[in-house]
């Protein structure tokens, strides 16, 4: 499956929007750093089938969308930027859904990749729990924003590797 050229542009725009969502100086938030245990092994494509990688990427973007579309994120972050961010993520989800259909078809089911998808979901559960424990403080959002930028960058790298394998 060939992701459209606009897909990689959308990735870059999403990262820029995340960077622009900064509300306070991160220098004051060092003590709030946290290990969210990013599921790195799910983004190492050594033994990945393409369909599995696409399913994991789809879950990653879906969970990012869910995280940033809560009332707490709306209260903490710039709404105009959030709206633009939703549009970019929505487009990426559509692109990946088309790919999943082409790659998986009727032969394989996304349930085959349940463990990988579950690992991504648990990662986002840890992020949500952290925000709750920190009472959605400004610094907690800064830490989460930095974490999502990092995981988003790793997702983009996986997409690049998939493209280079074509």
């Amino acid at each position: 499956c060939d992701l459209p050229q606009t897909h990689s542009l959308g990735n870059r725009r999403a990262l820029i929007l995340l960077a622009q969502m900064r509300r306070i100086s991160p220098f004051s938030c060092l003590k709030d750093r946290h290990d969210f245990e990013f599921p790195q092994e799910e983004f190492d494509d050594k033994q990945f089938q393409k369909a599995q990688a696409i399913s994991v990427l789809h879950e990653m973007i879906q969970q990012t969308f869910n995280l940033f579309s809560t009332k707490d994120s709306s209260a903490a972050l710039d709404e105009t930027l959030l709206d633009e961010f939703y549009i970019e993520l929505d487009q990426q989800l559509n692109d990946l859904e088309s790919c999943v259909m082409q790659e998986v078809g009727v032969i394989e089911s996304p349930l085959m990749y349940e463990d990988s998808i579950l690992a991504v979901r648990k990662y986002f559960q840890r992020i949500t729990l952290y925000l709750t424990e920190k009472k959605y403080s400004s610094c907690a959002w800064e830490v989460v924003r930095a974490e999502i930028m990092r995981s988003f960058s790793l997702s983009i790298n996986l997409q690049k590797r998939l493209k280079s394998k074509e």
Epitope: P26, F27, D35, M149, R150
Partner: antibody
Framework: EVQLVQSGAEVKKPGESLKISCKGS????????IGWVRQMPGKGLEWMGI????????AYSPSFQGQVTISADKSISTAYLQWSSLKASDTAMYYC??????????????WGQGTLVTVSS | DIQMTQSPSSLSASVGDRVTITCRAS??????LNWYQQKPGKAPKLLIY???SLQSGVPSRFSGSGSGTDFTLTISSLQPEDFATYYC?????????FGQGTKVEIK
Amino acid sequence: EVQLVQSGAEVKKPGESLKISCKGSGYSFTSYWIGWVRQMPGKGLEWMGIIDPSDSDTAYSPSFQGQVTISADKSISTAYLQWSSLKASDTAMYYCARHPGLNWAPDFDYWGQGTLVTVSS
Amino acid sequence: DIQMTQSPSSLSASVGDRVTITCRASQSIGGFLNWYQQKPGKAPKLLIYFASSLQSGVPSRFSGSGSGTDFTLTISSLQPEDFATYYCQQSYSLPITFGQGTKVEIK
């Protein structure tokens, strides 16, 4: 391979200005902060300040606030440390080092080779 | 500012010795404590981060422990290449601060 390459040694006179550099390569320059550390002859390490190259936000140690300026040019993956008027007491080795910011990763995991600044009349 | 105090400031030891260096913070810093090794004329090298995590490529004879205000760097069996100065550093809050250093010399 991650590398931080600093500019060469400098010999200056008191009152002169100076700008030294630290060029990052082998990683995404805007994904890490760059810190500057001073080491005076025979002494320990002193943290001077830090910059987030993604937006050039800076923070300084109170001891160095107003004495130096930290800047960055992300288009060429380079951070800078500058003085507008050097003093003999600025004679030291200056190191840059990368910091993961708010991400859970090792602090100051890569360092530049150091720039020796000598200020003497 | 958070003050970091290392002890001893210097020590003499022999190859094969077990060496312990301590670092105390003036207030609780959780586990945001790093250890560096510096040899003359060279840049510092990260050994331990987040109090007890061994940096990639660092020999397993180096270990770190502690949390809150009291931290320890241990070299289980001192090797000839370990003779150097060691610094602790807190990254709990700005300004980042270093200990004054501990010089490990040959007995």
